[in-house]
């Protein structure tokens, strides 16, 4: 029976006389007056079984004591680590001639577990053991013992095991502790692959190549290989696993992501949170669902925040001229978190009696640039009928419209072609400029051509290069624009309304909102 | 078994000589040392010193040099103590002693029954 | 030469009960003393060498321990046998031995 004692995890013991319960049992020759098995205490007041011999006053001394039969558990090179003690001859008096300090060690090997007698010429020789001149004193009981310690390696192994003997010559000397191991390189994980218990190879010198698994939840990337080396070490880890998607490595392992986390490929990378307007239920998600009314366009990416279609245009303005259209408008107010917005025109003949039966323009009208996809705010459609009633739709759409299409994405204006529409406006004047403010008044077109229903003012900081305007619409001749930065240079443009439709925009007065009030009168160019 | 065998009791007269023998058996003679103890009647045990069997090499504690030697005859495994010019002191028992030297320490581990001498005129 | 003194000179005990006797060195002894004990009319035995270690045959009863000049024989619980004298042995610088411990029956 062995009791448990710790050594490295790159040690597999086969034999330690410290570990044994009782007796030892070991074969001496002779059997009296050699090795003599003894029970010693140490520092714990456990028994030691040692044996010793200190056969010092004869001459030719020739002791042997050899161990039980020990399995080589596959291993083709062993080692075997003695402590021992040994008296100083000096120590003993009177013994000069006789008294040796060293021992030697022998090991043969064999199939048969139950080999009776030492029959010495079996045997090879390790070594001869000598006491190093640096020992480690133990407690043994309340005196301090003085310990040697000597390692020793044999090899290669081929029978299913061998025997150890210890050949005494004439030394003082107690074996305290006999230990037999082999190396191994133990069970690790390496870059997600486990590579198993190995037993080293035969030369001190060698290279066992192993072949890694891949852990579970990982795949392949290179072949997972290392090599074993003979001191029970691992060397020169070569390729890998990754984990699967949906697993992310933690402590060596392929762990599924956790609730509100994913990870679409197997790399080597964590799992990352679900992308704005997503979210995951399950464990090991390898992408995460949108939210309601949230879509994934098909090239979109896993990481890619989930996005809805955008809001409708704005400020949609028109402008007939015979039978041609040109339509103006701003971007939505909401892109839907996308970058890839663009504009569809759709058109549409209504009858003059019934403006609610409309049928497609068809494919006589031309659009330009085009009539889909279009990256402008902006489109001129020609060869319409004259005297026809028209309906005008621009849809915003972006990568994820088709998914969930609806009239709150589109803005319409209807119009007649072929009815004059009125002239410009030739002086548009500023009547009073504040800090926040402009005072526009300006005279009616030179031909009205029916009667103006309305007028409307497009403006827009300078800077911004009509990107970004504002329309106000009035039945007076004048207005008051409010909300406006100081010192900041604006562009007016104004332009009459009948029933057929809109007239060209004036010329554009270009105004700089003041520090201090003042009365500026413009004269339909540059006001400063 | 291992044992050692000492000679039954001797009355000397002052003066005389007296030789205890002490003959060894069931172990090598040659392979331990050979210690004399005395106990003087009612005392404790006093060391008087050893001989290499091997050797025949005395080593005499203090107090037992001159009137004391220790001799051997190897082929009969035996140890003597020869004890001259006798004085009344000298009346004790004489134990022979085989001496265990081991690497945790020595001791005298085989006795022999002990010889009785006494002196008195 | 080194001096032994052994104490008490006489241990008065009942079987069953523990026993612990004294040896102390004039100067140190290292681990090198033994114990022995003898029954009237009988010669020595050997029962402790290297000041701890059970010579062969001894009872697990007798335990010692001590190093350098103060040294204890223990008998854990004391049987009839064991009435006898005890004595204490160097071997660090020639031998000598102490005047003896006597236990008795109490």
């Known amino acids: 029976v062995t009791g448990s004692r710790v050594y490295p995890a790159n040690e597999v013991t086969l034999l330690d006389s410290r570990s044994v319960q009782g007796e030892l049992g070991w074969i001496a020759s002779p059997l009296e007056g050699g090795w003599e098995e003894v029970s010693i205490m140490d520092e714990k007041n456990t028994p030691i079984r040692t044996y010793q011999v200190c056969n010092v006053m004869e001459a030719s001394q020739n002791n042997w004591l050899r161990t039980d039969w020990i399995t080589r558990e596959g291993a083709q090179r062993v080692y075997i680590e003695i402590k021992f003690t040994l008296r100083d001859c000096n120590s003993l008096p009177g013994v000069m001639g006789t008294c040796k300090e060293t021992f030697n060690l022998y090991y043969y090997e064999s199939d048969n577990d139950k080999e009776r007698f030492i029959r010495e010429s079996q045997f090879g020789k390790i070594d001869t053991i000598a006491a190093d001149e640096s020992f480690t004193q133990v407690d043994i009981g309340d005196r301090i013992m003085k310990l040697n310690t000597e390692i020793r390696d044999v090899g290669p192994l081929s029978k299913k095991g061998f025997y150890l003997a210890f050949q005494d010559v004439g030394a003082c000397i107690a074996l305290v502790s006999v230990r037999v191991f082999y190396k191994k390189c133990p069970l690790t994980v390496r870059n997600l692959a486990q590579f198993p218990d190995t037993i080293t190879g035969a030369d001190t010198s060698s290279l066992v190549e192993v072949r890694g698994s891949c852990v579970n939840n990982s795949e392949e990337k290179d072949v997972p290989k290392m090599y074993c080396g003979a001191d029970g070490e691992w060397l020169v880890p070569i390729g890998n696993c990754l984990c699967n998607a949906g697993h992310e490595e933690q402590n060596g392992e392929c762990q599924a992501c956790k609730i509100g986390y994913y990870k679409a490929l197997s790399t080597d990378a964590s799992c990352a949170k679900c992308p704005p307007h997503s979210y995951s239920v399950w464990e090991g998600a390898t992408s995460c669902t949108c939210d309601r009314g949230f879509f994934r366009a098909d090239n979109d990416a896993a990481s890619m925040p989930c996005t809805r279609p955008p809001s409708a245009p704005l400020n949609l303005i028109s402008n007939v001229n015979e039978t041609s259209v040109n339509l103006e408008w701003s971007s939505p107010q909401n892109t839907g978190g996308r970058q890839d917005i663009s504009y569809n025109v759709v058109c549409k003949k209504c009858g003059a009696g019934d403006p609610s039966k409309c049928r497609p323009c068809g494919s006589g009208v031309h659009y330009t640039p085009q009539q889909n996809g279009l990256k402008t705010t902006r489109v001129s459609i020609t060869d319409l009928l004259a005297h026809t009633n028209y309906t005008f739709e621009i849809w915003a759409v972006n990568g994820v419209s088709k998914y969930n299409p609806s009239p709150d994405q589109s803005v319409s204006v209807t119009v007649t072609t072929n009815q004059a529409a009125p002239s410009s406006i030739a002086l548009v004047q500023a009547k009073e400029v504040t800090r926040y403010s402009v005072a526009l008044a300006w005279l009616e077109p030179d031909r009205p051509n029916g009667v103006i229903l309305e007028y409307e003012v497009k403006y827009y900081e300078k800077d911004q290069n009509e990107r970004s305007y504002r329309i106000v619409r009035t039945a007076a001749r004048n207005t008051d624009i409010k909300g406006l930065n100081p010192l900041t240079s604006y562009v007016f443009h104004v332009r009459a309304r009948t029933a057929a439709g809109y007239g060209d925009f004036s010329e554009p007065l270009e105004v700089t909102t003041n520090t201090v009030p003042s009365r500026i009168i413009g004269d339909g160019a540059n006001s400063t | 078994q291992v044992q050692l065998l000492q000679s039954g009791a001797e009355v000397k007269k002052p003066g005389a000589s007296v030789k205890v023998p002490c003959k060894a058996s069931?172990?090598?003679?040659?392979?331990?040392?050979m210690s004399w103890v005395r106990q003087a009647p009612g005392q404790g045990l006093e060391w008087m010193g050893w001989?290499?069997?091997?050797?025949?090499?005395?080593t005499y504690a203090q107090g037992f040099t001159g009137r004391f030697v220790f001799s051997l005859d190897t082929s009969v495994s035996t140890a003597y103590l020869q004890i001259s010019s006798l004085k009344a002191e000298d009346t004790a028992v004489y134990y022979c002693?085989?001496?265990?030297?081991?690497?945790?320490?020595?001791?005298?581990?085989?006795w022999g029954q002990g010889t009785l001498v006494t002196v008195s005129s | 030469e080194i001096v032994l003194t052994q104490s008490p000179a006489t241990l008065s005990v009942s079987p069953g009960e523990r026993a612990t006797l004294s040896c102390r060195a004039s100067?140190?002894?290292?681990?090198?003393l033994a114990w022995y004990q003898q029954k009237p009319g009988q010669a020595p035995r050997l029962l402790i060498y290297?000041?701890?270690t059970r010579a062969t045959g001894i009872p697990d009863r007798f335990s010692a321990s001590g190093s350098g000049t103060d040294f204890t024989l223990t008998i854990s619980r004391v049987e009839p046998e064991d009435f006898a004298v005890y004595y204490c042995q160097q071997y660090g610088s020639s031998w000598t031995f102490g005047q003896g411990t006597k236990v008795e029956i109490k």
């Open positions: 001989i290499n069997t091997n050797t025949g090499n005395p």
């Open positions: 069931g172990y090598t003679f040659t392979s331990y040392a």
């Open positions: 290297g000041a701890s």
């Open positions: 100067q140190s002894v290292s681990s090198n």
């Open positions: 002693a085989r001496v265990r030297l081991t690497v945790y320490g020595d001791g005298m581990d085989v």
